[in-house]
């Protein structure tokens, strides 16, 4: 089960400093942006990060939107990356969820997060380099250290 | 570049075994979905089955359930389709494509050149 | 299953004229649909998205329309490379995906 908490904006970067951004296709990439860059491209930099208590505590159970014409939330339903045209919804009666992942920090780098799906445990978002572009995937972890399923989450409140 | 690259054109008779490969490259292929698709000659498209390498975890279309296998080699970045007794009826193009995340989600958006099956006594 | 069915089966139109294609779902599928190209001796190429969103490098004389059962591919002012056969696919209820028969683009 899990209770929607408080919410809060943020800008999430991979650890190429690159900024997580919905493009008008609905697709999300990471894109070389400064801070003021990825203030102008708001609302599709600005990610509603909410959180949920957890009636099996594993991490802080978050959803992560944005809302650019309308609120689409991240799902990874079939290990498939997709943001739903949906709010994120005030309660989940189940201890699994497509659209929740578990925040945790890296151990030794109180800065540095992971986010892991609720629905695959083991598998966690990452940047991942696809051609020129580095886009969201999921990504099962295979090695220890492993930097593309690491991310800065910095609060825009 | 992104690419599925399959394996050659095959001839067999009936009752013989085969696998088919398809490769893929250029992108972390044990993240991603490779469905299966046939196209018999002057036909359309039809699903077959899904495998996701990194877990070799796979889908079937009840069509093509028990009649073929999708495996793969998440080591060689790998998938397979294998019949263990050909039909005449089997003879077609069959083609792997990547199923997209993130970006096209649940679409073919990388397909493979396609692997020429024919099937005769 | 959901079955898709497309029509015209054979769409003959003229190079730089208006060319629309249709795809029906047995039932509704939202906006889970996508539009492939297939030209003689080459594997299909996704085309549209969504229903509606062009992939990377498709041309803005592509566009699609439509949601729940009702969809159309147009195609605004024909160039002679976009004669080939066009397929609708829903992704609705994946895995569980379906093409439509495909509809050929020729030249009149």
């Known amino acids: 089960y899990f209770g929607k908490l408080e919410s809060k904006l943020s800008v999430i970067r991979n650890l190429n400093d690159q900024v997580l951004f919905i493009d008008q296709g609905n697709r999300p990439l990471f894109e070389d942006m400064t801070d003021s860059d990825a203030r102008d491209n708001a609302p599709r930099t600005i990610f509603i990060i909410s959180m949920y208590k957890d009636s099996q505590p594993r991490g802080m159970a978050v959803t992560i939107s944005v809302k650019a014409e309308k609120i689409s939330t991240l799902s990874a339903e079939n290990k498939i990356i997709s943001f739903k045209e949906m709010n994120p919804p005030d309660n989940i009666k189940d201890t699994k969820s497509d659209i929740i992942f578990f925040q945790r920090s890296v151990p030794g780098h109180d800065n540095k997060m992971q986010f892991e799906s609720s629905s695959y445990e083991g598998y966690f978002l990452a940047a991942e380099k696809e051609r020129d572009l580095f886009k969201l995937i999921l990504k099962k972890e295979d090695e220890l250290g492993d930097r593309s399923i690491m991310f800065t989450v910095q609060n825009e409140d | 570049e992104v690419q599925l690259v399959q394996s050659g054109t095959e001839v067999k008779k009936p009752g013989e075994s085969l696998k088919i490969s398809c490769k893929g490259s250029g992108y972390t292929v044990t993240s991603y979905w490779i469905g299966w698709v046939r196209q018999m000659p002057g036909k359309g498209l039809e699903w077959m089955g899904f495998i996701y390498p990194g877990d070799s975890e796979t889908r079937y279309s009840p069509t093509f359930q028990g009649q073929v296998t999708i495996s793969a080699d998440k080591s060689f970045n790998t998938a397979f389709l294998q019949w263990s007794s050909l039909k005449a009826s089997d003879t077609a193009m069959y083609y792997c494509?990547?199923?997209?995340?993130?970006?096209?989600?649940?679409?073919?958006?990388?397909w493979g050149q396609g692997t020429m099956v024919t099937v005769s006594s | 299953e959901i079955v898709m069915t497309q029509s015209p089966a054979t769409l003959s139109v003229s190079p730089g004229e208006r060319a629309t294609l249709s795809c029906r779902a047995s039932?509704?599928?939202?906006?889970?649909l996508a539009w492939y190209q297939q030209k003689p001796g080459q594997a299909p190429r996704l085309f549209i998205y969504t229903a509606s969103t062009r992939a990377t490098d498709i041309p803005a004389r592509f566009s699609g329309s439509g949601s729940g059962t009702e969809f159309t591919l147009t195609i605004s002012s024909l160039q002679s490379e976009d004669f080939a056969v066009y397929y609708c696919q829903q992704y609705n209820n994946w895995p569980s995906i379906t093409f439509g028969q495909g509809t050929r683009l020729e030249i009149k």
């Open positions: 494509a990547r199923v997209g995340s993130g970006w096209y989600p649940y679409t073919f958006d990388i």
């Open positions: 039932e509704s599928i939202s906006s889970n």
